[in-house]
Structures are given as C-alpha cells and as structure tokens.
Interface confidence: low
C-alpha cells in the first residue's frame, strides 16, 4: 500500500509542478535594476554583476553568482581564469576534462609513459619498452612509467607468465631498446585556449549524466560559448541565441555548445559539425573504438584478436596497457547483507566494467533490456505529457492495486502454509556521495557551474528518498531507473514531471535477464548483469532514485545500485539485489536466492 | 611587471570611427578580463567597456552600446575597442584596465597611461 | 550624473584625518564590494581599496575602506601633502561597473 501512496504521491507532485504555483513577480522587478523577470520560472531573479554569472537559473541573491570562466578556462586558486591545457599533441590523451575549478589533465597515450612531466600534462612520451627474450613483465608500463622487466622463472613460459606478456608489443621488438619519444619537438604542455579545437571531453561524461563542469551546461544571464552577444538577452526574447560561432552547435537547451573535434590521428569525421548538431567523429578504418566520448570516441585500438568468449579487462584508466582474458565463471551469490555503515559501493568488480575516460558512452557498446530511449542528447527519454500524465496515473493505481491483491493473497497464503516472512521491504540506504575531484573546494556557496541547482524540496526529497519503500514484486521485475542529473539551462527551471523516476513493470516471471547500467563516478559504467531462474512470482528489487548531492559539486552525481541491509519481517518478496562492496571478490552483481 | 600600453587616439570628426589598441605585458593576458575606462576632461571616471578573458563576455556602457564594440587578440596580448559612429561627447582620455583581484571582485588592478580621443568638427 | 554619489571636494591638514563618502543604492554597493581608486594630477588612475576594505599591497595603512547598506567611505589618517589627488569610488552594477563622481582632496 505504501508504494502505491508513495507513487501517487509523486505523480502528485509532479502535477502540481507541471502548473507552476507561483504567481507571476513582474511588479516587483520593474524599475529595480538588479532585478530581472525571467518567464520561465515565472519569478524575480537577482542580476549578477559584471565578470560574474549565476550558479543557477534564477539567482536569488549575490550568493548565487559567482565568477565564471568561459570554456577551456577553469578558475585557478588564485580565483583567476586560466586556460586549460591541451591534450592536442598525438601522444597525449585526456586524463580528466576542464572543469570549472582544476585545469584539464593530460596523459601519455597507452603504450606510451611519460619522461618529461609538464603541469598537468606531459612534455615529453616515450613508448613502453618490450621485454627482451628470458624476461618477463614485471610490472607493466603505465602512462607514468616505463614497463619494468624481471627474469623469467624457471619452468615458466616466458612468453606467457604473466597476461600482460600475452599482448602485442606496444611498440617496437628491441627489447628494452632506448624508448623513442613521439614529437621531441614538442618539449613543453601548449596551454593555449583551444576554441572549439580539441575539445572531445568539454562534453564529458556525456549527456547521461551531464558532466557538472562542462562549461556549456552552465545557466548563463547572456550569452554562450560561441555567441558574442553585446548586451545580455532582452527579457523574453530569444534574439540572441539564434547563431553560434563556428565549431560550435546550438543544443537542445539552446546553448552554443562546442563541436567536437576529430583531429587525432586516429579519428575521421563521420558527420559534420551543423548549427544544431555536433560534428561526429568514429575510429579510421581498420580500428575499433574502446572508450566511447560524447560524438566521438576517446580512445581508438586496433581490431583486437580475442578468442570468442573473452572481455577486456581494462586496467587503470589510460595508465595500463588494455589486456584481454577470459571472462570468469559465475560466482557464488554473496548473500551478506550491506555493512553497518550503509554505503553505496565505490565501484564492482572491473571484470564487469567497461572504463570511459571521462566519457560515458552516448550509444551504449553493450546489448541492454533496459528500456532506456536515447535522445540525440543521450538522456532517457521520458516524455511526460499531459496525456501520458494520466495514462501513468490510471495504469499505477489499476497496476498498483492488482499487484497489492495478488501479492497480499499470495503471501498470506504462502505465509500460512510455510510460517515464513516474506515480505522484504528494501531498506533504501543513501549512498555517502564521493567527489570526484579531490580539491579542497572554495566554499559551500559556491556550487557546480554546471549543475542543477533546482534541489529538491523538502516535501519532495521525502517522497523520492523515502527510507521504507516496501516492494512487492509478484508482477513482476518493477524497478526505478537512473535518471540524469538535470541540467541547468536557462530554460531549465524547475523540473518538470519529467525529471521523477518513471517505473517500468515486466509482466515476465521467470529468467529475468535485467542489464542495468550505472553511472559510476563520471568515468565508469557499470554493466550489471543478473540472470535469475526465479520462481513465479518473484522479482528483483532494484534501485530508487538516489538522492541529489547535496551541493552538487561533484562532477558527476553517480547514481549507485541500492543495497539492502538486514530486512525487517513480513514482506513479499523474497529475491533481493546484492551488490558488492569495493574490493570483494565476487566480480558479478547477483541475486540473492529465495531464502 | 605588469604594464598596458594605449594607442590609436587622435582627432577625429564627428560619426567617424576610430579604433584603440591596448599592448598587455608582465601577465598572463588570457587569464584576465580586461576593459576600457574613460575621463571626458576635468570629469570624472566612467566605465566603457568589459571583455572577458577569451572573449565569450561582452559588456558595454548604455552610452555606447551599439556604436562601439571592445575585441582582444589574446595571441597577441592586445586589447582592441572599435569606435564607430563618434559623438562629441566621446571625447576623453581612454584608458585600459585588468579586470581584477578574482572571485567576487571587480576591481580595476592596473591601469594604462591613456589616449587621448578628440572628437570635433 | 554618476550613480554613485561622492561629495566634489573634501580637505584636510597634513596629520589630520579626513573622510570621503559614497552612497549608492541596493543594486551596486547594496549587493557588490566596494572599490576606492586614487588618481594623481596628470596620472592615469590607481586601485587604493578594493572589496571594502582590502589594501592592495604598496598602499599605507592609512588609507582604509568601510561598507555599511548602500553607503561606503574612505578614511585617511595621518593626512600627507602627497594624498592631494582625486578620489573615486566605485562598484560592479548590473553588467556593468560604475563610478562615483570623484572628490578632490586638497591638502592645506
């Protein structure tokens, strides 16, 4: 029952929100100059200064402005807009994209370490050397370090004693030969603005979980990257966002956002750069894409020769060569309950990651029966008309209610016959958010430039973090996907009803085969599989919505697959989602069995 | 040592235009805001223009809106304001400014020497 | 007509300790930092105070700023004949940056 109110509730409140309460302000802007009226959010904003830009929509105070850096420049420690390194240079790749407060980072491609470190960047790459015949890999070449051999051990192969000896050499067959750098002309990090140059990660993480620090998700009182504006937009006109610059495209939110570049060597330009679409870019012939980028792909290797029945086991981000290796065979189901503590796991097992520097993938590289829709701008699209408003209405509570019948009859009778307590309801722990970057931050007030600020209210967060959400699953694998961080664009706002979590129910009752993707800390998508040869009318609980950060700060709000603690009694479900802790064994997310 | 140095001012009759240039040295010029400040003679102070440091952020002042248009060439460390349309009331001694201390700040940090603008007929 | 508001002149005898104001409203002192600028005769202008009450360094600590609502002043104690100069105050506006109409300090 309580899901049932839980539901209406935010259905609820997503209608009230779709009718905005508030009453027009317009009186009390007129004739304040530090006021304006936006229309769409239908109240008065506060008027940032010059040389200062809102953190939000429609800043309410001085508080809510804060100085802000075109793209490519990020706010030094010394509050002063510097320009981002670039990560150009063909033996270079992006380790970690412009953000607002911390410059981009660069790294030695893979395959390569750097000799001559550079701020934020390398100067000078080298290629890994290749163990020589008799020596084994003894520690394998990093972006940072050269590849450091050791003699084989006798009765061993020397060829294969370790799995980083069974790749190709990344460079050429003189072993420990003396490494050759790539461009020696190139002796120190340019960091000179690239505008609209080399950009693949000014669109990071995608717009699935729209990177915070793209400097092209930031709300802006007038104008964008790319459009030179000479005042700020009169009020309720959309005079000046009608032409970007070249290189830059006009999205969906109507912001000037810089195309993507296709100018590594390993890159060509599949589609071009258009006024309302990014340039593409995909792997040159002959070359398979590893690391998905928004429009691009940020890492290129050649076709790999695996067996049939191998995955790639990525290591370390760029620092670490790419390895192939059997796929293990399932796992015990680890049945423990989550940790006093509650947290969220950091990240599973790498077996079943597939690492995006900085990127998470638009199109997604791997087979999903996740009912997610793709926009062009990669956010699940979930249109949420008037229309589809009471059509979901009508459908939770007919669907609510013959769930709640059948599920309570089948317990009960279940519960009679086997004295045992079946219903579960799933404890919904909070994860404890980790930044993503590890700088000291300024201050509380200063948020995200390119988060959304619209927080939940208070009523509202009560109903999307409820702690109790009893679950029962007799109809099925209901479960809540992740939605993206919202932007905040100007025409952004308050969310929409299109912002809430929308249940998908499965009518299927047995081999439930449900892909989940997770977003993980900006640069990780987690591919959980579950295979269930479930009883009828059982299901698996999976994940709520997790709750917005509190000041959005990090890059990336990751949205984490909730844990179950120990269940209190008298539940209906049976089958629980067990998700590993950092650091266990068990590589796969499984599902508990009936207990 | 940070220095700004002013150029291009002259006579000019009134609707002409007249283009100023500022040579920045002694800092990292991309990192800076940078704007122009005017002095009509014996008055005071008044604020003409702000760019931002890659040129994404353009403010004028009401009274020249439209007539002036303020462009850096960060490759070069020159700050440029293009005025077109020149009243006599234009007439000042143009000078060019840092754009300031950093977060919340908007000072004025270090200043140019000056060109003097002259429009008469 | 500037929108900060400062008095034209002001004087005072060396030693002694002289005020200049400004005022100004809500949407320019009222919600921004305050910035005091010094300009010698002939000489282009100088920064003397910046956020309120902050010295750039090179500036005696005689100089010193205040902010109280839509009201700011600038204090020198220990008057020199080398203050003799033009003062301006000013602060960020709406997307824009304005200045007092300066007061001359004359040094009897």
């Known amino acids: 029952m309580r899901v049932l109110l839980a539901a209406l509730g935010l259905l609820f409140l997503g209608a009230l929100r779709a009718f905005p309460q508030d009453r027009p302000f317009e009186d009390t802007c007129h004739g304040n100059p530090s006021h304006y009226y936006d229309k769409a959010v239908r109240r008065c904003c506060y008027r940032c200064p010059m040389g200062l830009f809102p953190t939000q929509q429609c800043p309410q105070r001085p508080t809510d402005c804060r100085k802000q850096c075109e793209p490519d420049y990020y706010l030094d420690e010394a509050d002063r807009c510097t320009a981002c390194v670039t990560c150009s240079r063909d033996d270079l790749v992006e380790k970690t994209p412009c953000a607002w407060n911390s410059s981009r980072v660069c790294e030695c491609r893979p395959g390569m370490f750097c000799s001559t470190s550079a701020v934020n960047s390398c100067a000078r790459c080298f290629f890994h050397s290749v163990c020589p015949a008799g020596m084994i890999v003894k520690f394998p070449g990093t972006a940072q370090k050269n590849t450091v051999c050791e003699p084989a051990s006798p009765g061993v192969s020397p060829a294969c004693a370790s799995p980083e000896n069974c790749k190709e050499p990344s460079s050429g067959t003189i072993p420990q030969a003396k490494p050759t750098p790539v461009s020696p002309a190139t002796s120190s990090a340019s960091t000179m603005p690239v505008r609209g140059g080399t950009r693949l990660a000014q669109e990071a993480a995608s717009k699935l979980t729209r990177a915070p620090d793209s400097p092209s998700s930031v709300g802006r009182p007038s104008s964008d990257p790319g459009l030179s504006p000479t005042q700020p937009c009169p009020e309720g006109s959309g005079d000046c966002r009608k032409q970007c610059e070249p290189d830059y495209y006009l999205d969906e939110a109507g912001r000037c956002t810089a195309c993507v570049s296709c100018s590594r060597d390993d890159l060509v330009e599949k589609t071009p750069c258009a006024w309302n679409s990014s340039r593409t870019c995909e792997c040159r012939p002959g070359m398979i894409c590893a690391t998905s980028a928004t429009n691009s792909c940020a890492r290129c290797v050649p076709y790999p020769i695996c067996a049939a029945e191998t995955v790639t086991k990525p290591q370390d981000m760029a620092e670490k060569d790419t390895t192939f290796e059997a796929p293990p065979l399932g796992t015990q189901p680890d049945c423990n309950p989550t940790p006093e503590n509650g947290e969220a796991p950091a990240s599973t097992s790498p077996t079943q990651s597939l690492l995006v520097d900085s990127q998470a993938s638009k199109t997604l590289p791997i087979p999903t029966s996740a009912p997610v829709a793709l926009s062009s701008t990669g956010k699940p699209v979930l249109d949420a008309g008037p229309v589809l408003f009471w059509v979901i209405l009508v459908l939770v509570v007919v669907v609510g209610s013959s769930a709640f019948l059948l599920c309570h009859r089948r317990a009960c009778r279940k519960r009679i016959r086997q004295k045992l307590h079946l219903c579960y309801p799933v404890q919904t722990s909070q994860p404890k958010l980790e930044l993503v970057d590890s700088r000291p931050r300024r201050s509380s007030t200063q948020l995200r430039s390119g988060a959304s600020v619209t927080e939940p209210v208070a009523e509202e967060r009560g109903l999307m973090s409820q702690p109790l959400m009893e679950t029962c699953h007799s109809v099925g694998a209901a479960y809540l996907e992740s939605l993206p961080l919202q932007d905040a664009s100007p025409a952004g706002g308050p969310s929409s009803p299109r912002d809430l979590p929308e249940p998908r129910v499965s009518t299927e009752h047995t081999n439930n085969k449900i892909e989940k993707i997770y977003i993980m800390k900006a640069d990780t998508v987690i591919v959980g599989t579950v295979k269930a040869e479930l009883p009828e009318g059982r299901g698996l609980a999976g994940p709520a919505e997790p709750e917005l950060e509190e000041e959005l700060e990090a890059d990336h709000t990751p949205h984490y697959p909730e844990q179950e603690t120990e269940p209190p009694l008298g539940s209906c479900s049976d089958v629980m989602l067990s998700v590993e802790e950092e650091g266990k064994e068990d590589p796969l997310p499984t599902a508990a069995s009936g207990k | 040592e940070v220095q700004l140095l002013e150029s291009g001012g002259g006579l000019v009759q009134p609707g002409g235009s007249l283009r100023l240039s500022c040579a920045a040295s002694?800092?990292?010029?991309?990192?800076?805001?940078m704007s122009w400040v005017r002095q009509a003679p014996g008055k005071g102070l008044e604020w003409v223009s702000y760019?931002?440091?890659?040129?994404?952020?353009?403010y004028y002042a009401d009274s020249v809106k439209g007539r002036f248009t303020i462009s850096r060439d960060n490759s070069k460390n020159t700050l440029y304001l293009q005025m077109n349309s020149l009243r006599a009331e234009d007439t000042a001694v143009y000078y060019c400014?840092?754009?300031?201390?950093?977060?919340?700040?908007?000072?004025?940090?270090?200043w140019g020497q000056g060109t003097l603008v002259t429009v008469s007929s | 007509q500037s929108v900060l508001t400062q008095p034209p002149s002001a004087s005072g005898t060396p030693g002694q300790r002289v005020t200049i104001s400004c005022s100004g409203s809500?949407?320019?002192?009222?919600?921004?930092?305050v910035y005091w600028y010094q300009q010698l005769p002939g000489t282009a202008p100088k920064l003397l105070i910046y956020?309120?009450?902050q010295r750039p360094s090179g500036v005696p600590d005689r100089f010193s700023g205040s902010k109280s609502g839509t009201s700011a002043s600038l204090a020198i104690s220990g008057l020199r004949s080398e203050d003799e100069a033009d003062y301006y105050c000013?602060?960020?506006?709406?997307?824009?940056?304005?200045f007092g109409g300066g007061t001359k300090l004359t040094v009897l």
């Open positions: 400014a840092r754009y300031g201390y950093g977060y919340y700040d908007g000072s004025f940090d270090y």
């Open positions: 002694g800092f990292t010029f991309s990192s800076y805001g």
């Open positions: 760019i931002s440091g890659g040129s994404y952020y353009t």
């Open positions: 809500s949407s320019n002192i009222g919600s921004n930092y």
């Open positions: 956020r309120n009450n």
């Open positions: 000013a602060a960020d506006g709406p997307y824009n940056y304005v």
